[in-house]
C-alpha cells in the first residue's frame, strides 16, 4: 500500500546548467493523496533557506504527480545557487533535497559551451512543449 504522506521528488544533489537571459522553469515534483499541500520555494544562503516571495509560480497537474514550478523569466546571473521546495502537510513541514542552478552569463560565456551545457540544452527545447497555467503568489 502506497504511503499517503506528501513526497517531494527533487533528486538529491541534482543540478541544472542554464543560460542567463533564457526562460527556465524549476520543477518541484509533489506527490499527495487528497488535498494538495501548500508548497513554497526558498533559496539557500549558507545554512538558511530564504523564502522566495513575489515570484511567479504555477502548478502543473499530471496523472500520478503534480509539479510546483518556479518561473525564471528570464534567468538572471544572480539566480545562480541552490533551491529547495517545502510543503506544509497536516502541520508538518516536509523539505525537499536542494537542487543547484549553474547560471552561465551569456556575456562572459566562451564561444564553445561546456559538455554539461551541451547535454542540458536539448532538454530546454522540449520542456517548453508543456503549457502551464501561471499565477502569482
Amino acid at each position: 500500500k502506497e504511503s499517503c504522506d506528501v513526497q517531494l521528488y527533487i533528486k538529491r544533489q541534482s543540478e541544472h546548467s542554464i543560460l542567463a537571459g533564457d526562460p527556465f522553469e524549476l520543477e518541484c515534483p509533489v506527490k499527495y493523496c487528497a488535498n494538495r499541500p501548500h508548497v513554497t520555494w526558498c533559496k539557500l544562503n549558507g545554512t538558511t533557506c530564504v523564502k522566495l516571495e513575489d515570484r511567479q509560480t504555477s502548478w502543473k497537474e499530471e496523472k500520478n504527480i503534480s509539479f510546483f514550478i518556479l518561473h525564471f523569466e528570464p534567468v538572471l546571473p544572480n539566480d545562480n545557487g541552490s533551491y529547495r521546495c517545502s510543503a506544509n502537510f497536516q502541520s508538518n513541514l516536509i523539505e525537499s533535497h536542494s537542487t543547484t542552478l549553474y547560471v552561465t552569463d551569456v556575456k562572459s560565456a566562451s564561444e564553445r559551451p561546456s559538455k554539461d551545457e551541451m547535454a542540458s540544452r536539448p532538454w530546454l527545447l522540449y520542456r517548453h512543449h508543456h503549457h502551464h497555467h501561471h499565477h502569482h503568489h
Partner: antibody, heavy 120, light 112 residues
Framework: EVQLQQSGAELVKPGASVELSCTAS????????IYWVKQRPEQGLQWIGR????????KYDPRFQDKATLTAEISSNTAHLQLNSLTSEDTAVYFC?????????????WGQGTSVTVSS | AVVMTQTPLTLSVTIGQPASISCKSS???????????LIWLLQRPGQSPMRLIY???KLDSGVPDRFTGSGSGTDFTLKISRVEAEDLGIYYC?????????FGGGTKLEIK
C-alpha cells in the same frame, strides 16, 4: 522488475570512438540517475560519471572528463556512454548502474556490463 | 577526490567462520542532510556487482542477515557472521556523499 540491458561487446581500433547503450525496464530513467562504471581486467571499479536523464545534466570524474560523454533519451528509456580516442587503457568492461530511488539516490541495480576491447 | 581504503586485500575464511572488512575514507562521509552515503557491494566471479548494504547499515532486500554494516564518519566495517560458499567474491565499499564518487580497492573473500 528492474532491469538494465546493455549493448553487446565491442572490438575497436585505437583512436576510434565507440558508443555503448543501456536500456532500462521496470522504471523510468528520468526518475533517477544513471551512473557508468569502468572495470579493467582483473582490476577494481572506477566511477566514470552520472547523468540526470530528466535534464541531461552530467557530472564526470575529472579523469574521464575528456574521454567519456554521457547522454540519455527519455523516449526510449535508454542511456548512452560514448568513449573517444580509444587506447589500450580503455579496454575494460563498462557497467551502467541505476542511481537508486527517492530519497537516497544511491546506486542499486547494475547492468550486465559491456566488454570493450581496443586492439589493432 | 575522496580516497576509500579497504583492508585486507584478501581474506581467506573457513565456511561457518566470521569475516570482517574495513573501509576508511579520507573525508567524512556524513552529508549535510544527516545521512551517510556509504554502500557495500559484492561482485561474485563473472557477475556484475550487487548492492548488499546502503546508508552504512541498511540491508538490501534478499540479503541474508548474516551481513551487517556499521561505522560512521570515516571508518566503516562489513561483517559476515558465518561465511557461506555463496559469499565468495570481491567486496567493494563506495561513497555517494562527495563528487567524484569513489570506490574502495576491493577485498577478495576466498573460501579456505
Amino acid at each position: 522488475e528492474v532491469q538494465l540491458q546493455q549493448s553487446g561487446a565491442e572490438l575497436v581500433k585505437p583512436g576510434a570512438s565507440v558508443e555503448l547503450s543501456c536500456t532500462a525496464s521496470g522504471f523510468n530513467i528520468k526518475d533517477t540517475y544513471i551512473y557508468w562504471v569502468k572495470q579493467r581486467p582483473e582490476q577494481g571499479l572506477q566511477w566514470i560519471g552520472r547523468i540526470d536523464p530528466a535534464n541531461g545534466h552530467t557530472k564526470y570524474d575529472p579523469r574521464f572528463q575528456d574521454k567519456a560523454t554521457l547522454t540519455a533519451e527519455i523516449s526510449s528509456n535508454t542511456a548512452h556512454l560514448q568513449l573517444n580516442s580509444l587506447t589500450s587503457e580503455d579496454t575494460a568492461v563498462y557497467f551502467c548502474v541505476r542511481g537508486g530511488d527517492h530519497p537516497y539516490y544511491v546506486m542499486d541495480w547494475w547492468g550486465q556490463g559491456t566488454s570493450v576491447t581496443v586492439s589493432s | 577526490a575522496v580516497v576509500m581504503t579497504q583492508t585486507p586485500l584478501t581474506l581467506s575464511v573457513t565456511i561457518g567462520q566470521p569475516a570482517s572488512i574495513s573501509c576508511k575514507s579520507s573525508q567524512n562521509l556524513l552529508d549535510s542532510d544527516g545521512k551517510t552515503y556509504l554502500i557495500w557491494l559484492l561482485q561474485r566471479p563473472g557477475q556484475s556487482p550487487m548492492r548488499l548494504i546502503y546508508l552504512v547499515s541498511k540491508l538490501d532486500s534478499g540479503v541474508p542477515d548474516r551481513f551487517t554494516g556499521s561505522g560512521s564518519g570515516t571508518d566503516f566495517t562489513l561483517k559476515i557472521s558465518r561465511v557461506e560458499a555463496e559469499d565468495l567474491g570481491i567486496y567493494y565499499c563506495w561513497q555517494g556523499t562527495h563528487f567524484p564518487r569513489t570506490f574502495g580497492g576491493g577485498t577478495k573473500l576466498e573460501i579456505k
